[in-house]
Interface confidence: low
């Protein structure tokens, strides 16, 4: 964890007495002192002196003193090259350099894996001035190391726009294995092979993997990470996990459940949402999906009439939204309805059957064999018909509606008559002579008015001219004229 506390800026008691002109090359960092973490640029101070150029990682001084003695090349002193430590331990390392006092504007920065560490509260720079040189020690400390602290650390110093780079210090943080890929829960087909993957990393490497199924180890010998377990097939649900081992110990992955796909449970609670004469809207609650998504559902409909032939109508629909309108049903009929749904494994059993009824509808066919003739003696038109087949009445017949249209010399008027359900004939008064009368008849139930029959026309002559020939519509499929007695 990174805390934001700044170390006191006081010299470390590394060197007894006055500071020497150059640091020892085998200076070892203190590894166990707890230091604050966080990244901030270190504050640098140095005496202001005339500058000089340098090249590369070593600065070659060009200026000589009065005695013309050349100055030594500038370079960071060698320090510890590789630090190995356990996670959560503290670490401190440093780099040091002696800079002649003639140089000014010296700044030291810390870099990790090629990126500058900005904002490090735990980077401290100390200056130890002498008559001719200033010794500079830049310290870097981490209170509780994490894996993310692994890497190569260097110091860089800028003098008069030139750069000096230290040797790298490699930090290796070791800990328990860390999973980069864990097995995932799956729904699989019975007795079908599938793979599970487990990957963990150190350091320290290597990381070895053991697989565990239902609390028992699957492999006696460990496999190097990453490991793929091929399971030849399961017949029942199982829980798998993997163990990752390295020299620091053991980490166990999450346990994942492998489910066996099965056919779904049957839908429950089929409900009637709405009924009309020819359709029923149903809804249902899907059963358990058997660990495999529903694909579609089948609505099975059979007539509940014991005299029916027992045939089943099948309607297929999508699994959502658990709602279906069954169409093309007969009016005033009773039906048994069941629902079954399928996933990739197969069809569920059928839900409990429910009973549903369609309502009364308007008739679907017109009255048959409509015949019209003139009864001149009483100045009436006689109309006769046959009622539609009971199956096609779509309800209880309550009567008939007769439309008669009278057309003569540009005049046209339509009249409507209602007739009771028991009749199959009607008599209407002649409205206009020397005119054509067009008659159409429709059956009526409580569900509404059915279609009108094809028009039948009869000419009504002027008074004194008689035509006893009837006009009629033939019965469907019957080419012979209907004999009216």
């Amino acid at each position: 964890a990174i805390t934001e506390a700044r170390e006191e800026a006081k010299p470390y008691p590394l060197f007894p007495g006055p500071f020497p002109g150059s640091l020892q090359t085998d200076h070892t960092p203190l590894l166990s002192l707890p230091h604050a973490s966080g990244y901030q640029p270190a504050l640098m101070f140095s005496p202001t002196q005339p500058g000089r150029p340098h090249t590369g990682n070593v600065a070659i001084p060009q200026v000589t003193s009065v005695e013309s003695k050349p100055l030594p090349p500038l370079a960071f002193k060698h320090t510890v090259g590789h630090i190995i430590l356990s996670e959560h331990k503290g670490v401190k390392f440093n780099c040091s350099i002696s800079v002649p006092n003639i140089y000014q504007d010296t700044t030291i920065s810390w870099w990790k894996d090629g990126k500058e560490l900005l904002g490090a509260h735990h980077a401290i720079t100390q200056f130890y001035p002498d008559d001719e040189v200033t010794a500079i020690i830049a310290s870097f400390s981490i209170t509780s190391v994490q894996r993310s602290d692994n890497g190569s650390y260097i110091c860089k110093m800028k003098i008069n726009n030139e750069e000096i780079v230290s040797d790298p210090i490699y930090i290796e943080v070791q800990g328990l294995p860390h999973f980069t890929k864990q097995p995932e829960s799956m729904n699989v087909t019975r007795n079908t092979a599938f793979n599970l993957t487990c990957q963990a990393v150190g350091p320290p490497e290597p990381v070895n993997i053991f697989w565990v199924q239902n609390s028992s180890r699957v492999n006696e010998q460990p496999e190097k990470s990453p490991s793929v377990l091929t399971v030849p097939g399961l017949t029942e649900m199982a829980v798998f996990s993997c163990e990752a081992h390295n020299d620091k110990g053991l980490t166990v992955s999450k346990g994942v459940q492998i489910n066996i796909k099965a056919i779904p449970s049957p839908p429950t609670e089929v409900s009637i949402r709405n009924s009309t004469a020819h359709s029923i809207l149903i809804s249902w609650v899907p059963g358990f999906d058997g660990y495999s998504p529903f694909r579609n559902c089948s609505i099975q409909v059979k007539e509940a009439d014991p005299l029916s032939n027992g045939s089943v109508m099948i309607f297929n629909t999508s699994a959502l939204p658990h709602l279906y309108q069954i169409k093309q049903l007969q009016a005033l009929a009773n039906y048994s309805i069941g629902v079954s749904c399928m996933n990739e494994i197969g069809w569920s059993a059928v839900s409990p059957w429910i009973l549903a009824s369609t309502t009364e509808g308007a008739p679907s066919v017109a009255p048959l064999n409509v015949t019209v003739f003139l009864n001149e003696s009483s100045d009436n038109v006689d109309i006769r018909w046959m009622k539609p087949p009971t199956k096609q009445q779509d309800g209880e017949l309550v009567g008939y509606r007769i439309s008669h249209v009278w057309q003569s010399a540009g005049i046209s008027k339509e009249l409507l008559e209602e007739v009771g359900q028991n009749g199959s004939r009607a008599r209407i008064s002649v409205q206009v002579h020397n005119a054509t009368c067009t008659v159409r008849i429709a059956a009526v139930t409580r569900g509404g008015v059915g279609p009108f029959s094809d028009p039948v026309k009869i000419f009504i002559p002027a008074h004194g001219w008689v035509d006893y020939a009837p006009s009629s519509t033939p019965a469907p499929g019957n080419a012979d004229p209907v004999l009216i007695i």
């Epitope: 609670e269 409900s271 709405n274 809804s283 609650v285 939204p321 658990h322 709602l323």
Partner: antibody
């Protein structure tokens, strides 16, 4: 999260009509019924009817048939309930609710209610 | 129409008491179709229990429901002050959907 937000309070004269709206969010509007329930002052809850937004299928309490009309606008996920020929005994808080009809039939989310006052 | 009759209409109870509210239906209802709601003053009703005994999301475990046929019960174990409300039963078996007349619970 699922929310049903209703329109504001209304004051109407007897014989007039009122149209209350209910905007749904946080779920797929066309998958669940919207029901309307009312509550007269100091009284219990009375179901008016439901509408299924996906196809506009409605079911009314016989008591309100012919006077209440439920509609939806799926483009805005909004349901509407219009009540005509208002009488003083229609004074009530009108709630829209989401109907969960899996095996019937409960109301899992409710709007905040719209107060309708009918007064001459 | 299925008529639901709740008992009692009103109850005044002290905290920590156990409360039982009953709801009687005029015809037999499958337990799947029976639900309870809680309505606090000036608030919308809130689903409390669905399908006779399932607690709705966020409902404390002191609430429970039971019943079958025509008789259903809502029980509150160890009543708390926040439970002061009116409780309604509801049937979803047939249209019109109907509610009980409500039971008002007052905390002494």
């Amino acid at each position: 999260q699922v929310q049903l937000v209703q329109s504001g309070a209304e004051v109407k004269k007897p014989g007039a009509s009122v149209k209350v709206s209910c905007k749904a969010s946080g779920y797929t509007f066309t998958t669940y019924d919207i029901n309307w329930v009312r509550q007269a002052p100091g009284q219990g809850l009375e179901w008016i009817g439901w509408i299924y937004p996906r196809d506009g299928y409605t079911k009314y309490n016989e008591k309100f048939k012919g006077r209440a009309t439920m509609t939806t606008d799926t483009s805005t996920s909004t349901a509407y309930m219009e009540l005509r020929s208002l009488r003083s005994d229609d004074t009530a808080v009108y709630f829209c609710t989401r109907g969960y009809y899996d095996n019937l039939y409960y109301f899992d989310y409710w709007g905040q209610g719209t107060t309708v006052t009918v007064s001459s | 129409e299925i008529v639901l009759t709740q008992s009692p209409d009103f109850q005044s109870v002290t905290p920590k008491e156990k409360v039982t509210i009953t709801c009687s239906a005029s015809s037999i209802i499958s337990s799947n179709y029976f639900h309870w709601y809680q309505q606090k003053p000036d608030q919308s009703p809130k689903l409390l229990i669905y399908r006779t005994s399932n607690l709705a999301s966020g409902v404390p475990s002191r609430f429970s429901g039971s019943g079958s046929g025509t008789d259903y019960t809502l029980t509150i174990n160890s009543l708390e002050a926040e439970d002061a409300a009116t409780y309604y039963c509801q049937q979803g078996r047939s249209v019109p959907l109907t509610f009980g007349q409500g039971t008002k619970l007052e905390i002494k």
